[in-house]
């Protein structure tokens, strides 16, 4: 077969749309991406051209190989839609939109506690707050380092809350909480709060 | 570009049922939050509940009970089932999409579908 | 449940004029305030977030301030199409809401 195909031929499925991707669909501002666009044909000298809207971002020639596109997201309107044409000699396809999702990234959290002191027991409630932050933020409760609750789902601004009561206990126990949301690999923590034993009038948390 | 088209609307008797419906374009509603809101002839605006990328439904307190949102993935549309209607439920029902996939400012918004509900 | 509650409920001005409208929250919500502008027959279009943040294509005569509990809405010189109605919103809590939406103020030509 000839490696040049006319306009009739592309109008088939012998010459497809390209696909445009991207390893992360969520990003955050100022963060630098790269985008693919590929085709099935992987015999043609295929010329790929990016645009986001109308804008004509930049051009590669590539054979076989899809052509990478390296980008910043500075704005919020540079979230997309981003479209890849792909095209042979006068005849061209183009890709489906691709559109990436900005997320601001959480803020570190502030764990706050609130004790009520019984003879036997600690009732503990635990609040935890990202000020900043895409939603939905997850918020998880630790204590000595060990997750004591699932992950809190949080759709608004008001803090997480976890509740649980201890015996009381004889020796020190650190809280924190750690917040994230839907950016990958990107989790803060809440400076540690400790608790201290019962020994003596030593609870600056408690509610007698 | 993103867009919301809401359908559904007309003349319902009280004590009937209607489902609106928003379709959204150019955005993936899997990432963001869709509300619904209401405005009766010469009132204010009032929100009416959300639905969240996993699905998860939240209400005014008003609302609860008698309105249902939902939402279809594949046709990337929400919904707004209204049952029990009364008189006092005649207004311009719009969608809008919030800028984030929790509460937050609604940017984007559907031009309204009129709901009458009269005998 | 957090209540908003604009003022005034309606407002008569000039072409030219500085106009404020304020907002107050029942209990404070941080800066997580916007702002709408509303013509008649027509769907509502943001104007600010967080509380004092312009929206894409907004002219810069809107401005907005505030956090905690009290807010405003300035337009520094009012033009013929800023006559419309206003809301603020709370985008703060979602615990027992009746409604995130401020009453509105109507600014109408004197």
């Known amino acids: 077969r000839k490696a040049v195909l006319d306009c009739e031929a592309m109008k088939t499925n012998e010459f497809p749309s390209p696909c445009l991707d991207s390893k992360t669909k969520v990003v955050m501002k100022g963060q630098n991406v790269s985008m693919f666009c590929s085709h099935k044909n992987k015999s043609l000298q295929i010329t790929y051209s990016l645009f986001r809207r109308k804008t004509h971002l930049g051009t590669q020639d590539g054979k076989g190989e899809p052509a990478i596109f390296n980008l910043s997201i500075t704005e919020a309107h540079e979230s997309g839609p981003y479209k890849c044409k792909a095209q042979v000699t006068s005849c061209s396809k183009y890709s489906r939109d691709f559109s990436f999702t900005i997320v601001d990234p959480v803020t570190s959290p502030v764990l706050n506690i609130m004790v009520i002191q019984t003879e036997t027991d600690r009732h503990i409630t635990l609040h935890c707050l990202s000020v900043n932050g895409s939603l939905p933020i997850n918020y998880t409760f630790f204590e000595n380092h060990v997750a004591i609750s699932p992950a809190i789902s949080k759709y608004d601004r008001e803090p997480a809350e976890f509740n649980l009561t201890k015996k009381n206990p004889g020796e020190e126990e650190e809280y924190r909480c750690e917040a994230k949301n839907r950016l990958p690999n990107y989790a803060t923590y809440s400076h540690p709060v400790t608790m201290p034993s019962t020994g003596g009038d030593s609870c600056p948390f408690c509610l007698k | 570009e993103v867009q919301l088209v809401e359908s559904g609307g007309g003349l319902v008797q009280p004590g009937g049922s209607l489902r609106l419906s928003c379709a959204a374009s150019g955005i993936d509603l899997s990432y963001y939050a869709m509300n619904w809101v209401r405005q009766a002839p010469g009132k204010g605006l009032e929100w009416i509940g959300m639905?969240?990328?996993?699905?998860?439904?939240f209400y005014a307190n008003w609302a609860k009970g008698r309105f249902t949102i939902s939402r279809d993935n594949s046709k990337n549309t929400v919904y707004l089932q209204m049952n029990s209607l009364r008189a006092e439920d005649t207004a311009v029902y719009y969608c809008a999409v919030g800028s984030d996939g929790g509460i937050s400012d609604f940017n984007i918004w559907g031009q309204g579908t009129l709901v009458t509900v009269s005998s | 449940d957090i209540q908003m509650t604009q003022s005034p409920s309606s407002l008569s001005a000039s072409v030219g004029d500085r106009v404020t409208i304020t907002c107050q929250a029942s209990q404070s919500i941080s800066s997580y305030l916007a702002w709408y502008q509303q013509k008649p027959g027509k769907a509502p279009k943001l104007l600010i977030y967080r509380a004092s943040t312009l929206a894409s294509g907004v002219p810069s005569r809107f401005s907005g301030s505030g956090s905690g509990t009290d807010f405003t809405l300035t337009i520094s010189s009012l033009q013929p199409e800023d006559f419309a109605t206003y809301y603020c919103?709370?985008?703060?809590?979602?615990?027992?809401?009746?409604?995130?939406f401020g009453q509105g103020t109507k600014v109408e030509i004197k």
């Open positions: 639905i969240v990328g996993g699905g998860i439904t």
């Open positions: 919103q709370q985008a703060y809590s979602l615990s027992n809401v009746d409604n995130f």
